[in-house]
């Protein structure tokens, strides 16, 4: 029994004085507490308390469940505790099942002992299969049995108490370990789609899909800059033990302009967060917006090819594309393709090829794209680069020479006159008129100049050159002079291509 | 004899937060998990978490995603559950249930929370 | 989430009745043979109060009548013979994994 010192308030004293009692089941427990001050006896067994308000605390046929700790309290607070085995060869243990173990921490398994005298106090594991190699524990007999530092692999692992009484093992009843992993790493979220396009009054529905070793796990949509409370619906799995999976489908279901903006799904646990974004954006109605990928004014040489390539947008899908020139649509000659296969893909390419092009072939190449809400258009002006054509080399009656040319671009006109019987014309003559006529041919066919000089400033044999040129080339026609006596002739015009 | 005594009645307006006590007696109080339960005016039993023995950490329905936050006070052997952005849907008796020996042998007498305008 | 579907949902019977409800879960309970499956029984404006757990087992202070049984998916809670004080709401419940999920509830009537 405690002593104190003179003065000092004591704590009660217990009859029988000593720490432990064992008693048969079916005897009497006869527990007396003497203190002047004394307030109340305490029973607490498997963390449960009853009260006695009497001094003595008897029990006439004790059973097994009368086992545990009897405290003797006084009204200084102070106390004495006896602990009291009460045998029973029947039943050996008290036991609460509940057994859980968070990862790396210690957990009690709730079994103590009604004798302290019974030998090999451990644990075994269910129908006979062996512990983990690895599993420790220390038992002891008024608690239970305490497994050191769980494993995340003891997760429903089934053991017993088990003593050894007479000779023979004697197990509890049977407990299932459930572990609550730590958290060792953030979530992994995911998100459905990286982003939305819709319009006015189209459902918004996007998923989030939350992986953790537990449910525990916490996640919610959230709207940037906004506390609004969003709608959301879970569906979950355990893939087998720490596999935990959630879905959490956020959904408007008639989404407005106002509904555009960046959702967030934000998973937490105790080790750290993870977020992912999706974009939305509505639309109050669908668009087509096109890309010219070249220039949409074209030169392009005679017999050369060209590609007029656009990139557009359009949503909803586009129904109906075509590629137009004077009037006539192309059937062939042209491909149009989804710039990605992603399935929120809303860009597309369309190229129309054009081989080996005629000076006739310039004009206006015009792609036509539609979907259900808009059409749209975008124009080519193609022009054919061509090398001069001298249509017409003449001399008037009024003693004229005329030089008539046709190309793309426009033409120019030199005049040079070569006396007797040099090569090389070199000597340029001014013209005395030029003009630009008008093509009965498209807009954008050749142009045709006409350029006149007079006659009657030569003097001596020679030949008259005509030479109409551009950027792709010149072609030259000539006149040939011969006097007799006073007269002038023109004798044979030829022409002479010079590439 | 174990006992489980909850905090009384609670009218409360949409948006604003609720925290309901239990007060435990008759047994260790850090030894054993605590659950929370509620139950809609004519329907079923709905499981909210619970808070375990010993750290004291928690489990959430993910249905209550955020809303609900249970602790403990060991000092008054009392277990709280307060539950925030209340809508008329929160309108419940809400239950304190200890655990043991694998089941919820022990239930508070229940708190009703009105949420209403 | 394990989903509990009990039936019938309602039930109108006499005093000394023979009552059977059933509980089915979506997927098995049971860990290493053990059931993780509880009954309770509720009266208006009372808490739940236990009367089965694990399956099986009668908890302390309940009437005999009462027994459970079933194990896996199925389960069921069957009353001997009625008495008028169990005229009640009564629910399964699992707790193998979490969240722990009750069934709809069966209300048990006086016909």
């Known amino acids: 029994q405690p002593s104190v010192s003179p003065g000092e308030p004591s704590p009660p004293s217990i009859h029988p004085g000593k720490s432990d009692l064992i008693v048969r089941v079916g005897d009497e427990i006869r527990l007396l507490c003497t203190d002047p001050g004394f307030v109340k006896w305490t029973f607490e067994i498997l963390d449960e308390t009853n009260e006695n308000k009497q001094n003595e605390w008897i029990t006439e046929k004790a059973e097994a469940t009368n086992t545990g700790k009897y405290t003797c309290t006084n009204k200084h607070g102070l106390s004495n505790s006896i602990y009291v085995f009460v045998r029973d060869p029947a039943k050996l243990f008290l036991v609460d099942r509940s057994l859980y173990g968070k990862e790396d921490n210690d957990t009690l398994v709730r079994c103590p002992l009604t004798d302290p005298e019974v030998t090999n106090y451990s644990l075994k594991g269910c129908q006979g299969k062996p512990l983990p190699k690895d599993l420790r524990f220390i038992p002891d007999p008024k608690a239970g049995i305490m497994i050191k530092s769980v494993k995340r692999a003891y997760h429903r692992l089934c053991l017993h108490c088990s003593v050894d009484q007479e000779g023979k093992s004697v197990l509890s009843e049977k407990f299932i370990l459930k572990v609550r992993p730590a958290f060792k790493a953030v979530p992994v979220v995911s998100v459905s789609k990286a982003s939305y396009l819709l319009r006015e009054g189209e459902e918004f529905t996007v998923t989030c899909t939350i992986k953790d070793v537990s449910s525990s796990v916490y996640s919610t949509w959230k709207r940037e800059n906004s506390q609004t409370k969003l709608q959301e619906k879970y569906n979950s799995w355990h893939h087998g033990d720490f596999n935990y999976e959630r879905q959490a489908t956020l959904t408007i279901s008639s989404a407005r302009v106002n509904d555009s903006g960046v959702f967030m799904c934000y998973a937490n646990n105790t080790f750290g967060s993870a977020n992912v974004t999706t974009t939305l954006e509505v639309v109050d109605k669908g668009f087509i917006n096109i890309f010219p990928m070249i220039n949409t004014t074209v030169f392009v040489n005679d017999g050369e090819n060209v590609d007029l390539i656009v990139e557009y947008e359009a949503f909803p899908k586009p129904e109906h594309q075509q590629w137009i020139y004077m009037n006539r649509t192309f059937t062939d000659k042209w491909e149009d393709y989804p710039k990605s296969e992603n399935e929120s893909n809303i860009r597309y390419v369309s190229e129309l090829h054009l081989t080996r092009l005629k000076g006739t072939e310039g004009g206006t190449y015009t792609f036509l794209v539609s979907n259900s809400d808009v059409n749209a258009a975008i124009a080519f002006n193609v022009y054919v680069n061509t090398k001069p054509e001298i249509l017409t080399y003449d001399r008037l009656v009024n003693g004229m020479l005329q030089c008539v040319a046709a190309g793309f671009p426009e033409p120019t006109i030199d005049w040079y006159f070569c006396p007797g019987t040099e090569q090389r014309c070199s000597a340029s003559v001014l013209p005395v008129d030029v003009q630009t006529l008008n093509s009965s041919g498209p807009p954008f066919g050749k142009l045709v100049v006409q350029s006149s000089i007079d006659s009657s400033a030569f003097k001596h044999n020679g030949t008259v050159e005509c030479k109409a040129y551009n950027d792709v080339g010149k072609t030259s026609a000539y006149f040939n002079f011969a006097f007799k006596g006073n007269n002038k002739e023109q004798i044979h015009p030829h022409t002479l291509f010079t590439p | 004899q174990v006992q489980l005594v909850q905090s009384g009645a609670e009218v409360k307006k949409p948006g604003a937060s609720v925290k309901v006590s239990c007060k435990a007696s008759?047994?260790?109080?850090?030894?054993?998990?605590m659950h929370w339960v509620r139950q809609a005016p004519g329907q079923g039993l709905e499981w909210m978490g619970v808070?375990?023995?010993?750290?004291?950490?928690?489990s959430y329905n993910q249905k209550f995603k955020g809303r609900v936050t249970m602790t403990t006070d060991t000092s008054t052997s009392t277990a709280y559950m307060e539950l925030r952005s209340l809508t008329s849907d929160d309108t419940a008796v809400y239950y304190c249930?200890?655990?043991?020996?694998?089941?919820?042998?022990?239930w508070g007498q229940g708190t009703l929370v009105t949420v209403s305008a | 989430e394990i989903v509990l579907t009990q039936s019938p949902s309602s039930l109108s019977a006499s005093v000394g009745d023979r009552v059977t409800i059933t509980c089915r879960a979506s997927?098995?309970?049971?860990?290493?043979?053990?059931?993780?499956m509880h009954w309770y029984q509720q009266k208006p404006g009372k808490a739940p109060k236990l009367l089965i757990y694990?399956?099986?087992n009668l908890e302390s202070g309940v009437p005999s009548r009462f027994s459970g049984s079933g194990s896996g998916t199925d389960f069921t809670l069957t009353i001997s013979s009625l008495q008028p004080e169990d005229f009640a709401t009564y629910y399964c419940?699992?707790?193998?994994?979490?969240?722990?999920?009750f069934g709809q509830g069966t209300k048990l009537e006086i016909k």
């Open positions: 419940q699992q707790n193998r994994e979490e969240p722990y999920t």
């Open positions: 249930a200890r655990e043991r020996d694998t089941r919820f042998g022990n």
């Open positions: 808070i375990y023995s010993g750290q004291g950490d928690t």
């Open positions: 694990l399956a099986s």
């Open positions: 008759g047994y260790t109080f850090t030894s054993y998990n």
């Open positions: 997927e098995s309970v049971d860990i290493y043979g053990e059931s993780f």
